[in-house]
């Protein structure tokens, strides 16, 4: 039987303390570097081993970062977003969106929050 994937989208506030090597992750995205079609948002592309984000454990590769220290990341050039992180200070508050795969049901089933409906 063919299946389909449904996703649960959740938001979380993550407070990181900048470590000796920084925050410890990479990003993709921005108005000039769309990673997701029709979405200029900023996404986590790499969590570096033993970095601040990895040691905290909550930020995940694939998460969308909505804001940094309360500053919205919408409609930013990629390098402007990078600079925002680099200049964010010692204590950094991230508002992130997790997208979790929650089921793989049969075709024809429409889960709650299905964007197709």
């Amino acid at each position: 039987m063919n299946g389909r994937v449904d996703y649960l989208v959740t938001e979380e506030e993550i407070n990181l303390t900048r470590g000796p090597s920084g925050l410890g992750f990479n990003i993709v995205g921005g108005t000039d570097q769309q990673y997701v079609s029709n979405d200029s948002g900023i996404y986590v592309s790499r969590i570096k081993e033993n970095g601040a984000a990895a040691l905290d454990g909550r930020l995940q590769e694939g998460d969308k970062i909505l804001s940094v220290n309360g500053q919205d990341l919408k409609n930013l050039l990629h390098q402007d977003a990078v600079d925002l992180f680099r200049n964010a200070g010692y204590a950094v508050s991230l508002r992130v969106q997790h997208r979790l795969q929650v089921q793989n049901g049969p075709i024809g089933h429409r889960g709650e929050g299905d964007p197709s409906g």
Epitope: N26, I27, R46, G62, V82
Partner: nanobody, 128 residues
């Protein structure tokens, strides 16, 4: 978690060619930097070639420049290493590696330039 499966290794005569493939799964391939490394008998594992997530930046070990070409096919979630004019000293186990691409939020220069997070099991290349 990223899973990497290499193929295409084998035995070839000096001067011959091989094309290694590495199929990736587990997360969007288009966001991954990819690399090929090799470990020769009794030696450390060395970087051979890398390609960034957008495909517009490559790196080659000096001794393979002009002979090896790294490329990627995002539609097939696969990275390739075309190896021409093979030499006996190219004999090694070749490993595919991956890491998330993009920009570090920490500094212009990423200290772990050749530090990769995910590794395949390797494929043997023997040049006689």
């Amino acid at each position: 978690e990223v899973q990497l499966v290499e193929s295409g290794g084998g035995l070839v005569q000096a001067g011959g060619s091989l094309r290694l493939s590495c199929a990736a799964s587990g997360r969007p391939f288009s966001s991954l930097d990819m690399g090929w490394f090799r470990q020769r008998p009794g030696k450390e594992r060395d970087v051979v070639a890398t390609i960034n997530w957008t495909g517009d930046s490559t790196y080659y070990l000096d001794s393979v420049k002009g002979r090896f070409t790294i490329s990627r096919d995002n539609a097939k979630n696969t990275v390739f290493l075309q190896m021409n004019s093979l030499k006996p000293e190219d004999t090694a186990v070749y490993y595919c590696a991956a890491r998330g691409g993009g920009s570090s939020v920490d500094s212009e220069y990423d200290v772990g330039e050749f530090k990769y997070d995910y590794w395949g099991q390797g494929t043997q290349v023997t040049v006689s």
